[in-house]
Amino acid sequence: QGCGEDKICQSNLQLVRARFCTRVSDTEFQPLPMDVDGTTALFALSGQPVIGLELMVTNLPSDPAQPQADGDDAHEAQLLVMLPDSLHYSGVRALDPAEKPLCLSNENASHVECELGNPMKRGAQVTFYLILSTSGISIETTELEVELLLATISEQELHPVSARARVFIELPLSIAGMAIPQQLFFSGVVRGERAMQSERDVGSKVKYEVTVSNQGQSLRTLGSAFLNIMWPHEIANGKWLLYPMQVELEGGQGPGQKGLCSPRPNILHLDVDSRDR
Amino acid sequence: ELEPPEQQEPGERQEPSMSWWPVSSAEKKKNITLDCARGTANCVVFSCPLYSFDRAAVLHVWGRLWNSTFLEEYSAVKSLEVIVRANITVKSSIKNLMLRDASTVIPVMVYLDPMAVVAE
């Protein structure tokens, strides 16, 4: 039954979708962004305890014009899942509870077998999500590759398929800046560089504050970070534009310390107006 | 990648009233942006190592507008926008490190002073 007139069950199981997702809620998943190659997902290692793998399996005729050629019932239809060391099987979810397959894993949760139906009927389509624990991912992990193989005792040649994601460590740093004040004014008379003794001789004062915040782990484990400010010190013809008087980093060194930045500002050694600090 | 400078929004903060400007308002048409990314200014990059950067850091930079340059070059200009840019860079042996939103643009508007004295 369900095997056509020739009584030979020629199924056409196809894994039409295998893509990594972020888990938004218990049964809501969002596909990960894709790399430029269009086939590799991008997984940001930033505290996501699990990753979803969306799987869609169909059993449809390969040629709608010849529906009897294949697409018969797939008996003992299964999906075999081989996980890398960095991922472990945690559970299965489906948008439609009726479509949720029974999935069993081995002891170390590295192999999973999902029962898709016995049989998986002609014309059937099933979508479900494997929930995979990311606890095994380390900063050395650069790629996730899950091998997937459909299996059935019906007549069909089946080949393994891989779902891939490139792992990157996204530093949760945010940066914002402001100028104090936001508007400046110029006036008076032209004076040469040599006539400048004090910073007050130069022109209107301005202070920039650039704040960097790190929402994640300490950067010490990842490398060395630098905060850079592109300071427009001269116009295109080489005349002074913004004269840098003082550059200080607060909070990147240790309690109460003021960090040193390079190069040193105030190259004309003008007298500092202490009232401005 | 550096983001484009913030644009002045129409009908928002206007430049001071033009009645005191020594040149006619017809001449005072230009709005100039001084920005190293556009090649209209030259920049020195101050780089500050974040040695023990666990939560936050603030870079404080004090400067002075070089009055004489503006008087010589821009006294007939309606307004100038001076752009300062800042970013974070990370040096690491880890190949798959990625920074998002790691740059910011800080614009300042500059005008000829109606009071005709250098602000102190």
């Epitope: 800046g177 402001m178 004040p181 929402q215 607060e250 909070g251 | 929004e9």
Partner: antibody
């Protein structure tokens, strides 16, 4: 939920001292410049003091003449205001407020704590 | 020290447009921020920077600036907008913050 909660207010005699606290939660406290602002009964808002992220830059309203000291403990997510030589005119609701990174604006305020200076 | 001057009181008919102004020398250099305060409550930021609204603030609130005057405009005032409004900016030293005296907005009708 991002919030600031002030405490430590109360009734104090002229010349006395009081220490106000502000407990921050729901955000990375050590990333923000913090401020105290006060409001006398029936009057307007008056800025009191500000402190930068690790306390290197501290400013006070001129009218306070060294009687108040602002401090912070980032490990405890707390802001403090030590008020000495209190006067009747210091009677006010004292608010702590967080300053936005990219603008001179106080985007999060506490509910305030009342300080009454009276004999 | 700089001062910011506001009208003590302003009234507007329900659904009409009202403008609250703030004057001060420091506003030539600094953008004003605007706060709404209802009786017995803490102030709430409504406008900051050029004309930025924090999330949750209705778009009937807008800000603008010209010369030494900053303005807060409420287009189509609602009964719930009745409150005290304060402007603030840095003072000319750049290190201190100064508040305006406040404007009591009454919504009529």
């Amino acid at each position: 939920e991002v919030q600031l909660v002030e405490s430590g207010g109360g009734l104090v005699k002229p010349g006395g001292s009081l220490r106000l606290s502000c407990a921050a939660s729901g955000f990375t406290f050590s990333s923000y410049t913090m401020n105290w602002v006060r409001q006398a009964p029936g009057k307007g808002l008056e800025w009191v003091s500000s402190i930068s992220i690790v306390g290197n830059y501290i400013y006070y309203a001129d009218s306070l003449k060294g009687r108040f000291t602002i401090s912070r403990d980032n490990a405890k997510n707390s802001l403090y205001l030590q008020m000495n030589s209190l006067r009747a005119e210091d009677t006010a609701v004292y608010y702590c407020a967080r300053r936005k990174w990219e603008h001179d604006a106080f985007d999060i305020w506490g509910q305030g704590t009342m300080v009454t200076v009276s004999s | 020290s700089s001062e910011l001057t506001q009208d003590p009181a302003v009234s507007v008919a329900l659904g009409q447009t009202v403008r609250i102004t703030c004057q001060g020398d420091s506003l030539r250099s600094y953008y004003a921020s605007w706060y709404q305060q209802k009786p017995g409550q803490a102030p709430v930021l409504v406008i900051y920077g050029k004309n930025n609204r924090p999330s949750g603030i209705p778009d009937r609130f807008s800000g603008s600036s010209s010369g030494n005057t900053a303005s807060l405009t409420i287009t189509g005032a609602q009964a719930e907008d009745e409150a005290d409004f304060y402007c603030t900016s840095r003072d000319n030293s750049g290190n201190h913050v100064v508040f305006g005296g406040g404007t009591k907005l009454t919504v009529l009708g």
